[in-house]
């Protein structure tokens, strides 16, 4: 899977959207590596 910063950001945005935004406060692009997905 793509692990550039932009890919990680878009993937996280999709995850946040699907979860209704109910995630940990530190679940942000700069804290989350590609392996989190």
């Amino acid at each position: 899977a793509c692990d550039t910063a932009t890919c990680v950001t878009h993937r996280l945005a999709g995850l946040l959207s699907r979860s209704g935004g109910v995630v940990k406060n530190n679940f942000v692009p700069t804290n989350v590596g590609s392996k989190a997905f």
Epitope: T4, T6, T9
Partner: antibody
Framework: EVQLVQSGAEVKKPGASVKVSCKAS????????MNWVRQAPGQRLEWIGD????????NYNQKFKGRATLTVDKSASTAYMELSSLRSEDTAVYYC????????????WGQGTTVTVSS | DIQMTQSPSSLSASVGDRVTITCKAS??????VAWFQQKPGKAPKSLIY???YRYSGVPSRFSGSGSGTDFTLTISSLQPEDFATYYC?????????FGGGTKVEIK
């Protein structure tokens, strides 16, 4: 309102260095990567690199490795791009840009900083 | 580096026309492609990410498609404010790279 506000135009001599700033507001600066892109007159956009403002990690376009340095001042929510050993081909508009998720999912760009390299 | 080849480099069109711009990557970039609009003297404005998703606020007349190496930006009915230069970008691999641009001019 998310804003990326860049420093003003610069005129430099060949061989000199330039440091462009990008002040972020309206979102949590350390949550999102900051990209730097440039555009020489009449040319395509060219990616310089990105920085993780939270940890300071960087990725550079090899074309600029060793000449470009990306840094941040977290306390001032400001990103910096320094380019050294300037040559005439570095004359361009330099942009900072960041894809933000909260408060609004969008790819925000600074207004651009014109850097002119001339003897 | 991945090369992004855009075509055409320029086109002339009228208000109401359907406009299609293509972008070809030199290797597989999955759907990790963005499209930008740029007007003279202004910063680029993001339109599309992940090949086919519009950012909020981008008019529905803009649509993107494609995967792998071939991508398309379509403007279904050209409006006066759409005359600009359009760029594709791949962000699947570092360094991110842009196409050479397509200038959409008034016929």
């Amino acid at each position: 309102e998310v804003q990326l506000v860049q420093s003003g135009a610069e005129v430099k001599k060949p061989g000199a260095s330039v440091k462009v700033s990008c002040k972020a507001s309206g979102y949590t600066f350390t949550d999102y990567y900051m990209n730097w892109v440039r555009q020489a007159p009449g040319q395509r956009l060219e990616w310089i690199g990105d920085i993780n403002p939270n940890q300071g990690g960087t990725n550079y376009n090899q074309k600029f490795k060793g000449r470009a340095t990306l840094t941040v001042d977290k306390s001032a929510s400001t990103a910096y791009m320094e380019l050294s050993s300037l040559r005439s081909e570095d004359t361009a508009v330099y942009y900072c840009a960041s894809i933000i998720i909260v408060p609004n999912y969008f790819d925000y760009w600074g207004q651009g900083t014109t850097v002119t390299v001339s003897s | 580096d991945i090369q992004m080849t855009q075509s055409p480099s320029s086109l002339s069109a009228s208000v109401g026309d359907r406009v299609t711009i293509t972008c070809k990557a030199s290797q597989n970039v999955d759907t990790n492609v963005a499209w930008f609009q740029q007007k003279p003297g202004k910063a680029p404005k993001s339109l599309i990410y992940s090949a086919s998703y519009r950012y909020s606020g981008v008019p529905s007349r803009f649509s993107g498609s494609g995967s792998g190496t071939d991508f398309t930006l379509t403007i279904s009915s050209l409006q006066p404010e759409d005359f600009a230069t359009y760029y594709c970008q791949q962000y699947n691999n570092y360094p991110y790279t842009f196409g050479g641009g397509t200038k959409v001019e008034i016929k």
